[in-house]
C-alpha cells in the first residue's frame, strides 16, 4: 500500500505544524476535522510556507486532491485579486503566495468554490465544488512554542517516539508543539516520559532534562552536559550551568538567559528567571510586564518645573511663560527680556554612547506622546471659543534615516468642539490624532523637526506660551524642538477644559503592519489593547452600536471626553504576491499596485513602541476571526459596515484590508 | 489523443462469470481513476466501481459488493471488472470511464473520457 | 443514496427552439453535477462539468446552471446534431455516482 494513503504525517517548524490526512472529506467535514484538533485548514500564504506543505504532501499521485483552507462564495469573484475573491477559512483575503493551477478567467461565478490542491508535481491549486469528498485535507496548527526533537543518547533503545495534541504520532519530527509527549526506551529497562511544557523563565521546552537512560555516568564525554555533569544517587546524570547561565531546553546545553534579549532595555544574568531586566534613567518597569519599559512622567511629580513642563519618553522640559526666563537650575523661572528659554531634561543622553543600538531612539520618536503639563498656579487657558487647532503632518522620513532623538512634540487637536464640562484637570492629555495623510512629504533632511502649525487659545500677556524659536544656539540641530507657529483666536467660553486628546498617523515602512492600537494618554494614561485572537478558536465578535465608543479593558474613565475623529480611508501599499505561474512553476511575480483594490476604510493606530516591526500578533500572525464555512443556500455579497466609533482590524502588511471585522455575518459562513 | 478501447461483447450463462478490459492510451495510466459504469437495457446508468492504478485502490457500489472485481495491469495500461454470479439482470453493456483530475483549473470528479462499452448478455 | 430525477423523460423540439432540461437532486450536492449526451449506440460524452463549467469542445449553445438540488442543461438553439438522450450525474459523495434517468431529445 502506498505511503501517501497510510497514515496521516506531519512537518512542524518551531510556531506551527502542517498534517496531512488522506481521508476522503468534503470541505465542510475537513475544516470541522482540522477544528476539532485544534487547527484549522492549512493556510499557506507565503513561499516559506508553501514549501513547507511541498516537502510534506512530496510527490503524490495526480489523482489525488487535498483541501486547503480557501472557500469562496457565490458570485464573489475578483479576480484581478491574487486570491481571485477566495478567503482564508481564518477570515482574510491576505496572501504573498498563490499558485493557481491556471491564469484567471471572466466568469460570473455563479456557485459557491473552494480549493484543492494537487498532491503530485507542483501541488498547484484548484477550485471546485466544495461538496465534493476529495481524498484528504490539510491542517495547519500553530502554537506558543517547540521543544526541539531529542537528542538520541547512547542507552537508549530506539528512537523517541513523539505524540502531537493534534494527535499524530511519529519518530520523524524535528519540532514537537506544546504539549507534545515524548516516549524514550532505554536499553536498561525502564524507559522515560517527557513533556514538552512551558517554561518558569518563559518559552517551552521538555519536563526533564536529559540523559533520560541509565548510562556511565559523567564519564564519557561530560554526560552530554555542555558545562558541569552531576551524577545523581539514583544513576541519573544531570547537567548544571556555571554563574550567569542556564539550562537549555535539550537539558545539556547552557545559554545565556540575555541573549534572546528578554528585556527592552537592560538585561542582567540571575535572579529567578535567570535574569533580571532594568530600566534606564527616565524609565522605569511597565506594571503590566516588568520586561519592558515606560517612560516616566516627571512632570506629574510637584515642583519639577516651576512654571510649565512637558514631558517625552526619556525626558522633560521646562519653559516659562513670556516676559521669564528660565534659570541655570533648568527647573526656577525668573522676570527677564529675553523670552522663549528652555531647559532639556533629556535623562537619556549620557546613556547614548553606553552600547544602545539607534532602534531605541527611533521608537521613542515613534511612541512619544508628549503632554504639555501647566504646573498649579498657572492658568493659561482663559474663557474663550474652543482651541481652532489646525494639524499639518507628520513629517515623513526615509527609513533608515529616521530622527535619532525624540522631540518635545505638544500637538493639538483638530478643530472639534470640545465637550462642555467644568474645568478641573491640570493635566493637557496630548496623543496621536487619527488625521491620515495619503501623501506625507519628506523633510529634506532626517533630522529636521516637524513644522506644525497651530492656533493656540489667547492668553493674558503674561502668561503666555513663548513662540519657540527655531534654533537654539545652546542644543545641537537634532535637540530642537518643533517650530510652533502660534496666532491668537477669539475668547473660549468659560470652564472649558483645552481638547487635546487626539492621535498622529504613524510611519509605517512599506510592507510593514500597524499595530492594534496601544493608546497612551498623558496623565490619566488611558492604554486600550485589542489582544491578538489565539489561533484556532473561534473569539467572541462584540459588535459595537453605531454611535458607541469602543471601551478600553481595565481603562480609568477619562477627565475629558475626546469625540471620535472620523474614519479616514489609507492608502495600502502594493502587494507583492509571490505567484507560481501554471506555465513556469518555480516563478514569481509581482501584482502591481494598480491591480490591488481600494483598501477598507481604516484607522491607523499608534505603534507600540515595544512593537514596532511585529505585525498584529507576532506569534500567529495570522490569526483573524474565523470563517466557518458552509454549503448551503445563496451567496449574498459580504456586506461591510463601520460603526462610527469603532476601530477596524488592521490592514495587514499586504495591503488587502482583513475582513475579520465588520462582516455582517453571510448566512453561509456558519 | 486519450482512448479507453474495451474488450468485446460476451453471452454467459447465469451463475457464470465475466472479465472484462479496458486498454488506456493517450495518457499517463496511473494519473486517472477508471470506472465502470453498467447501463441496462432501460437505458439507466449505474456505477459498478472504481480502481485507482497508481495504487490498486478500488471502491464498489454497495449493490455489487462481493460480486464485482477491479483490478489493474500497469505494465499493460489495462482495467478489468470482474462479475461473478451472474443473472439475467446483469444483461447490460458495461463501459470503463475515467474520471478527470481537472479541466481549466477546475477539480472534478465528472467523468471525461469513455470506452466504446461491452455487451454482456446473461442467457440461459 | 442520493436520487436525481429528470424532467421531461422524453422532449420534442424543432431545429432553433431553446430547450431545457431540469435535474433534481433528493439533497443537497452543491454543484457536483455533470451533463452527459449520449447518441443511440454510442457511449456518453461529457457536456457540462461542475454544474455550469462547459467542457472543452463542446459548442458555446450547451450551458449548465444551478446548485444545491436543482439543475438545468439549456440548448439555446438546437441543432439536427442534437438528437440524443442527455443524463445528469451527481458525485458530491464521491465515488458513489448516481446518474437521472435520462432525457430523450427528439427532434420534430
Known amino acids: 500500500q502506498d505511503p501517501w494513503a497510510a497514515e496521516p504525517r506531519s512537518a512542524c517548524g518551531p510556531s506551527s505544524c502542517y498534517a496531512l490526512f488522506p481521508r476522503r472529506r468534503t470541505f465542510l467535514e475537513a475544516w470541522r476535522a482540522c477544528r476539532e484538533l485544534g487547527g484549522d485548514l492549512a493556510t499557506p500564504r507565503t513561499p516559506e510556507e508553501a514549501q513547507r506543505v511541498d516537502n510534506l504532501v512530496g510527490a503524490g499521485p495526480a489523482s489525488r486532491l487535498l483541501w486547503i483552507g480557501l472557500q469562496r462564495q457565490a458570485r464573489q469573484c475578483q479576480l484581478q485579486r491574487p486570491l481571485r475573491g477566495f478567503t482564508w477559512t481564518t477570515g482574510d483575503q491576505d496572501t504573498a503566495f498563490t499558485n493557481w493551477a491556471q491564469p484567471a478567467t471572466g466568469g460570473p461565478c455563479p456557485a459557491q468554490r473552494c480549493v484543492a490542491l494537487e498532491a503530485s508535481g507542483e501541488h498547484r491549486w484548484l477550485e471546485g465544488s466544495c461538496t465534493l469528498a476529495v481524498d484528504g485535507y490539510l491542517c495547519q496548527f500553530g502554537f506558543e512554542g517547540a521543544c526541539p526533537a531529542l537528542q538520541d543518547e547512547a542507552g537508549q533503545a530506539g528512537p523517541a517516539v513523539y505524540t502531537t495534541p493534534f494527535h499524530l504520532v511519529s519518530t520523524e519530527f524535528e519540532w514537537l508543539p506544546f504539549g507534545s509527549v515524548a516516549a524514550v526506551q532505554c536499553q536498561a529497562g525502564r524507559g522515560a516520559s517527557l513533556l514538552c511544557v512551558k517554561q518558569p523563565e518563559g518559552g517551552v521546552g521538555w519536563s526533564r532534562a536529559g540523559p533520560l537512560c541509565l548510562g556511565a555516568g559523567c564519564s564519557p564525554d561530560n554526560g552530554g552536559c555542555e558545562h558541569e555533569c552531576v551524577e545523581e544517587v539514583d544513576g541519573h546524570v544531570s547537567c548544571r550551568c556555571t554563574e550567569g547561565f542556564r539550562l537549555a531546553a535539550d537539558g545539556r546545553s547552557c545559554e545565556d538567559p540575555c541573549a534572546q534579549a528578554p528585556c527592552e532595555q537592560q538585561c542582567e544574568p540571575g535572579g529567578p528567571q535567570g535574569y533580571s531586566c532594568h530600566c534606564r534613567l527616565g524609565f522605569r518597569p511597565a506594571e503590566d510586564d516588568p520586561h519592558r519599559c515606560v517612560d516616566t512622567d516627571e512632570c506629574q511629580i510637584a515642583g519639577v518645573c516651576q512654571q510649565m513642563c512637558v514631558n517625552y519618553v526619556g525626558g522633560f522640559e521646562c519653559y516659562c511663560s513670556e516676559g521669564h526666563e528660565l534659570e541655570a537650575d533648568g527647573i526656577s523661572c525668573s522676570p527677564a527680556g529675553a523670552m522663549g528659554a528652555r531647559a532639556s531634561q533629556d535623562l537619556g543622553d549620557e546613556l547614548l554612547d553606553d552600547g544602545e543600538d539607534e532602534e531605541d531612539e527611533d521608537e521613542a520618536w515613534e511612541a512619544f506622546g508628549g503632554g504639555w503639563t501647566e504646573m498649579p498656579g498657572i492658568l493659561w487657558m482663559e474663557p474663550t471659543q474652543p482651541p481652532d487647532f489646525a494639524l499639518a503632518y507628520r513629517p515623513s522620513f526615509p527609513e533608515d534615516r529616521e530622527p535619532q532623538i525624540p522631540y518635545p512634540e505638544p500637538t493639538w487637536p483638530p478643530p472639534l468642539s470640545a465637550p462642555r464640562v467644568p474645568y478641573h484637570s491640570s493635566v493637557l492629555s496630548v496623543t496621536r490624532p487619527v488625521v491620515v495623510s495619503a501623501t506625507r512629504p519628506t523633510l529634506p533632511s532626517a533630522h529636521q523637526p516637524p513644522v506644525i502649525p497651530a492656533t493656540h487659545p489667547a492668553l493674558s500677556r503674561d502668561h503666555q506660551i513663548p513662540v519657540i524659536a527655531a534654533n537654539y544656539p545652546d542644543l545641537p540641530s537634532a535637540y530642537q524642538p518643533g517650530i510652533l507657529s502660534v496666532s491668537h483666536p477669539a475668547q473660549p467660553p468659560a470652564h472649558q477644559p483645552p481638547m487635546i486628546s487626539t492621535r498622529y498617523p504613524e510611519l509605517f515602512p512599506a510592507h510593514q503592519s500597524p499595530m492594534f492600537p496601544d493608546t497612551q494618554v498623558a496623565g490619566t494614561q488611558t492604554t486600550t489593547h485589542l489582544p491578538a485572537i489565539p489561533p484556532n478558536r473561534a473569539p467572541l465578535v462584540t459588535t459595537l452600536g453605531a454611535h458607541q465608543p469602543p471601551q478600553a479593558p481595565d481603562a480609568p474613565v477619562l477627565r475629558t471626553q475626546a469625540t471620535q475623529l472620523p474614519i479616514i480611508p489609507t492608502a495600502q501599499p502594493s502587494l507583492t504576491t509571490s505567484s507560481r505561474s501554471p506555465v513556469s512553476p518555480a516563478h514569481q511575480v509581482s501584482v502591481p499596485a494598480a491591480t490591488q483594490p481600494p483598501a477598507l476604510p481604516t484607522l491607523l493606530p499608534s505603534q507600540s513602541p515595544t512593537n514596532q516591526t511585529s505585525p498584529i500578533s507576532p506569534t500567529h500572525p495570522h490569526s483573524k476571526v474565523p470563517q466557518i464555512p458552509r454549503e448551503d443556500g445563496p451567496s449574498p455579497k459580504l456586506a461591510l459596515w463601520l460603526p462610527s466609533a469603532a476601530p477596524t482590524a488592521a490592514p495587514t502588511a499586504l495591503g488587502e484590508a482583513s475582513l475579520a471585522e465588520h462582516i455582517q455575518r453571510d448566512d453561509r459562513w456558519l | 489523443q486519450v482512448q479507453l478501447v474495451q474488450s468485446g461483447a460476451e453471452v454467459k450463462k447465469p451463475g457464470a462469470s465475466v472479465k472484462l478490459s479496458c486498454k488506456a492510451s493517450?495518457?499517463?495510466?496511473?494519473?486517472?481513476?477508471i470506472h465502470w459504469v453498467r447501463q441496462t437495457p432501460g437505458q439507466r446508468l449505474e456505477w459498478m466501481g472504481y480502481i485507482n492504478p497508481y495504487d490498486d485502490d478500488t471502491t464498489y457500489n454497495q449493490k455489487f459488493k462481493g460480486r464485482v472485481t477491479i483490478t489493474g495491469d500497469t505494465s499493460a495500461n489495462t482495467a478489468y471488472m470482474e462479475l461473478n454470479s451472474l443473472t439475467s439482470e446483469d444483461t447490460a453493456v458495461y463501459y470503463c470511464a475515467r474520471r478527470g483530475n481537472s479541466y481549466d483549473g477546475y477539480f472534478d470528479y465528472s467523468m471525461d473520457y469513455w470506452g466504446q462499452g461491452t455487451l454482456v448478455t446473461v442467457s440461459s | 443514496d442520493i436520487q436525481l430525477t429528470q424532467s421531461p423523460s422524453f422532449l420534442s423540439a424543432s431545429v432553433g427552439d431553446r430547450v431545457t432540461i431540469t435535474c433534481r437532486a433528493s439533497q443537497n450536492v452543491g454543484t457536483a453535477v455533470a451533463w452527459y449526451q449520449q447518441k443511440p449506440g454510442k457511449a456518453p460524452k461529457l457536456l457540462i462539468y461542475?454544474?455550469?463549467n462547459r467542457y472543452t469542445g463542446v459548442p458555446s449553445r450547451f450551458s449548465g446552471s444551478g446548485s444545491g438540488t436543482e439543475f438545468t442543461l439549456t440548448i439555446s438553439s438546437l441543432q439536427s446534431e442534437d438528437l440524443a438522450t442527455y443524463y445528469c450525474q451527481q458525485y458530491t459523495n464521491y465515488p458513489m455516482y448516481t446518474f437521472g434517468q435520462g432525457t430523450k431529445l427528439e427532434i420534430k
Open positions: 461542475s454544474a455550469s
Open positions: 493517450g495518457y499517463t495510466f496511473t494519473d486517472y481513476v
